[in-house]
């Protein structure tokens, strides 16, 4: 079959301080030397762009500076971080992988990973 | 809203060149994939080539490879394509389509003709 | 190279009646990859379908995808005039991106 299968895990809960983890992990059909990982979040339909990374095999992933997303590369296996949730950014996390180079170009899309937020409980007013 | 506006197309003879323009609007061009896609006269859709974010990796159809180059100016939002050697049977109307955040063509542009012919 | 055939090549139908349009890939395609356009003459190809079954934005519920492996299937459920039209499948999860030759439905 001449797709790329990605795997990521079906559901995560969020730290209390709005952060949550998941692994990205594709099977490559071919020998890539250049990677590029989207994370998109589905939310009625509509998919939006989380964040995005392009990586050389055997080197660090590198978000842009401003991005809510880190991660590590690991063969072919991407360890991604999304912080700054919020309960209201609960939903569909779905992990895009491309291919890039050498040619030929491989698109695989993961189900997606339900990540879960709670907002914490703001801390009582001490009485003294 | 969402658009993309080519332009460019024309009368050309063979063997000679023009290059094809496609103005994007309405979303962040830099973020996704540019393809172009043709159509000869009363026949099916051909995939061209594209072009990928930063403008890095590109791919190309054999029957233009070493004759037309894709190239983007993301300062500009806008999608080239160099037709270069042209031949009767690249007479088509050229589209510019954008590669979706899950892959299908989901935007298009309205299409401009370019005839090849002596 | 993925080759696609589309069957039939026509189809003509009446107004109202269900239209079954079939999409062969010569070899397994993932689900996840596989588009449909609609193409009206003069006009530039509009997606209908991606994913095999997910339904673009804006597209009517008479629309509908399916399959998986080397075969798919469009089906228009009720057609309505504006639906006479070329159908395209498309594979897009692999270089080079293929199309089918096209499916034409016409008015009977």
């Known amino acids: 079959c001449k797709a790329m299968h990605v795997a990521q895990p079906a559901v995560v809960l969020a730290s209390s301080r709005g952060i949550a983890s998941f692994v990205c992990e594709y099977a490559s059909p071919g020998k890539a030397t250049e990677v590029r990982v989207t994370v998109l979040r589905q939310a009625d339909s509509q998919v939006t762009e989380v964040c995005a990374a392009t990586y050389m095999m055997g080197n660090e992933l590198t978000f842009l500076d401003d991005s809510i997303c880190t991660g590590t590369s690991s063969g072919n296996q991407v360890n991604l971080t999304i912080q700054g949730l919020r309960a209201m950014d609960t939903g569909l996390y779905i992990c895009k992988v491309e291919l890039m180079y050498p040619p030929p170009y491989y698109l695989g899309i993961g189900n997606g990973t339900q990540i879960y937020v709670i907002d914490p409980e703001p801390c009582p007013d001490s009485d003294f | 809203q969402v658009q993309l506006v080519e332009s460019g197309g024309g009368v050309v003879q063979p063997g000679r060149s023009l290059r094809l323009s496609c103005a994007a609007s309405?979303?962040?061009?830099?973020?996704?994939?540019m393809h172009w896609v043709r159509q000869a006269p009363g026949t099916g859709l051909e995939w061209v080539a594209v072009?990928?974010?930063?403008?890095?990796?590109?791919y190309y159809a054999d029957p233009v490879k070493g004759r037309f180059t894709i190239s983007r100016d993301n300062s500009k939002n806008t999608l080239y394509l160099q037709m270069n050697s042209l031949r009767d049977d690249d007479t088509a109307v050229y589209y510019c389509?954008?590669?979706?955040?899950?892959?299908?063509?989901?935007?298009w542009g309205q299409g401009t003709m370019v005839t090849v012919s002596s | 190279e993925i080759v696609l055939t589309q069957s039939p090549g026509t189809l003509s139908l009446s107004p109202g009646e269900r239209a079954t349009l079939s999409c062969r890939a010569s070899?397994?395609?993932?689900?996840?990859?596989l588009a449909w356009y609609q193409q009206k003459p003069g006009q530039a190809p509009r997606l209908l379908i991606y994913g095999a079954s997910s339904r673009a934005t804006g597209i009517p519920d008479r629309f509908s995808g399916s399959g998986s492996g080397t075969d798919f299937t469009l089906t228009i459920s009720r057609l309505e005039p504006e639906d006479f039209a070329v159908y395209y499948c498309?594979?897009?999860?692999?270089?080079?991106?293929?199309f089918g030759q096209g499916t034409k439905v016409e008015i009977k």
């Open positions: 070899q397994s395609v993932s689900s996840s990859y």
């Open positions: 309405g979303f962040t061009f830099s973020s996704y994939g």
């Open positions: 389509a954008r590669a979706g955040d899950l892959g299908a063509f989901d935007i």
């Open positions: 498309q594979q897009y999860g692999s270089s080079p991106w293929t």
């Open positions: 072009i990928w974010y930063e403008g890095r990796n590109k």
